[in-house]
Amino acid sequence: AQEVQQSPHCTTVPVGASVNITCSTSGGLRGIYLRQLGPQPQDIIYYEDGVVPTTDRRFRGRIDFSGSQDNLTITMHRLQLSDTGTYTCQAITEVNVYGSGTLVLVTEEQSQGWHRCSDAPPRASALPAPPTGSALPDPQTASALPDPPAASALP
């Protein structure tokens, strides 16, 4: 089954520094999102090979990309305290799949010793539940059912 490998699990950086997040898949995807989780999850970027990336206005001018959509490294520059959060990769494939998440802790330089990453990955409970099956729902009841495959009809 398709998976998204995401690294690092956690990183602590001072204000103004940069962070790299890598999202790797086995291929066969249409594109990849980086999303900041929270009460209202926010898309940060959408990246697709050969297409101008879509970037949230908050991060415009401070995001770089290297690699391809199958093995993408996203570099976020000039980090601010408000950028602290968990970021997860989402691959658009026949069944949408998610990375395990990267917890980015942005700290004021003098307090960096107080905030350290543990070795444990971010809690999976923060991520959306995967679909329970690929059967396509009846339109009358579909609002309560999981998504059909995102691109099953397309090559």
């Epitope: 249409r30 999102y33 959408y46 697709e48 297409v51 879509t54 658009i92 679909p131 998504d147 995102a150």
Partner: nanobody, 114 residues
């Protein structure tokens, strides 16, 4: 939660054209990965066409060369221009944001018949 409302369906003769619209409420539509699905009576729902945030498009084989998907981010709207319609295109058409597992819209009925 994003809400979707489809419109533009109707009765059309074979060889005719229709333009479907889907308006999405909510923010960040420019990030939406939008698809048009259809479901004919007694058949499974199938993805007809999709369009990424970067405007790249894909089409299912039965509609290639006849249907065109497009988007207008300023209007939070995705369109499906359907040309050279055939009786087998008869179905209820739904739009969907492929990013999420949210609710479907009600769809819009397209009937191709002489």
């Amino acid at each position: 939660q994003v809400k979707l409302e489809e419109s533009g369906g109707g009765l059309v003769q074979p060889g005719g054209s229709l333009r479907l619209s889907c308006v999405a409420s909510g923010s960040s539509f420019h990030f939406a990965f939008m698809g048009w699905y259809r479901q004919a009576p007694g058949k499974q729902r199938e993805l007809v066409a999709d369009i990424s945030p970067g405007n790249s498009t894909n089409y299912a084989d039965p509609v290639k060369g006849r249907f065109v998907i497009s988007r207008d981010n300023a209007k939070n709207t995705v369109y499906l221009q359907m040309n050279s319609l055939k009786p087998e295109d008869t179905a209820v058409y739904f739009c969907r944001d492929l990013r999420s597992w949210g609710a479907w819209g009600r769809g819009t009925q397209v009937t191709v018949s002489s």
